[in-house]
């Protein structure tokens, strides 16, 4: 699996989308988990409704929400009030019993809020096409990691 990078701004909401084959994963609940270390386990953060039929209902665990468009085949995760400690590697998963299929590997990057002048050294300026007129806009930039790029900092 390639890793897709989603960038969000600290204090704002970040929306992560995971597309999948709706027929292949029909009837399967989904989950969002956080990878603990490069080869460690993936710790469940939140999963969709216990009744697959109700997967469209948004479920929250703290500041993280999950909702599943089972017909369209898109799992959406919302990280509200993004914080630096939210940065890291995650997975979207399709559950079958005690097993899980990885739908997408996601690297969440948290960028400093350009309107927060407390830490001017970490300012990140939006490009021309991005606007911060509405502070509640859910903002995400995503890209795939280039071949050879490492999602975790090397350990010494």
């Amino acid at each position: 699996h390639n890793t897709t990078v989603f960038q969000g701004v600290a204090g704002q909401s970040l929306q992560v989308s995971c597309p999948y084959d709706s027929m292949k994963h029909w009837g399967r609940r989904k989950a969002w988990c956080r990878q603990l270390g490069e080869k460690g386990p993936c710790q469940r953060v939140v999963s969709t409704h216990n009744l697959w039929l109700l997967s469209f209902l948004r479920r929250w665990n703290g500041s993280t929400a999950i909702t599943d468009d089972t017909l369209g085949g898109t799992l959406t995760i919302t990280l509200r009030n993004l914080q630096p400690h939210d940065a890291g590697l995650y997975q979207c998963q399709s559950l079958h019993g005690s097993e899980a299929d990885t739908l997408r590997k996601v690297l969440v990057e948290v960028l400093a809020d350009p309107l927060d002048h407390r830490d001017a050294g970490d300012l990140w300026f939006p490009g021309e096409s991005e606007s911060f007129e509405d502070a509640h806009v859910e903002h995400s930039i995503s890209r795939s990691l280039l071949e050879g790029e490492i999602p975790f900092p090397p350990t010494s």
Partner: antibody, heavy 122, light 108 residues
Framework: EVQLVQSGAEVKKPGESLKISCKGS????????IGWVRQMPGKGLEWMGI????????RYSPSFQGQVTISVDKSSSTAYLQWSSLKASDTAIYYC???????????????WGQGTLVTVSS | EIVLTQSPGTLSLSPGERATLSCRAS???????LAWYQQKPGQAPRLLIY???SRATGIPDRFSGSGSGTDFTLTISRLEPEDFALYYC?????????FGPGTKVDIK
Amino acid sequence: EVQLVQSGAEVKKPGESLKISCKGSGYTFTSYWIGWVRQMPGKGLEWMGIIYPGDSDTRYSPSFQGQVTISVDKSSSTAYLQWSSLKASDTAIYYCTRQAIAVTGLGGFDPWGQGTLVTVSS
Amino acid sequence: EIVLTQSPGTLSLSPGERATLSCRASQSVSSSYLAWYQQKPGQAPRLLIYGASSRATGIPDRFSGSGSGTDFTLTISRLEPEDFALYYCQQYDTSPFTFGPGTKVDIK
């Protein structure tokens, strides 16, 4: 009408190779998982494995991993079960079956092929 | 893998009687992804019940399924002559999608 039609009975010698088929019709073949089930003479049903024709994702039962190969040909809407070296203990009826879906989720396996009798004897 | 145990191994009953077949799983079957099949000699299995309690298309209402977690039951309210056959339960929650050993319902 959704149908799975399997290839005919086979008589083989130990050590020979074999590929049996299961042709799907009446539905979008690439959108439903296809499973294979073994039934030895006078015995119960044994799950062998399953394949998703859309991307050929395959899951084998540990008992059959490395013993058989499950594959598909999307262009002919056909699933296959093959052996590279048959043993006398492979003598059985082999069924293919489709994972059904329901509004509420998954719906068991339906329909089933008519079965292919494989006899391995020297 | 999930191991399914069916009981009794054989059930000897007369037409018109009620048949109760049990299927127990070694671990919880989430989403109640448990099915029941009927198989007659020389025929392929036929789906009766899916999702533990939903009848498959064309299955008479004398067949009903119940249960959740690890304990499931297939009930045939009044046995008809054509109901004497082998019955298998199957979990399709966790791969491999295992079957129970079967219960034979025969004529007393």
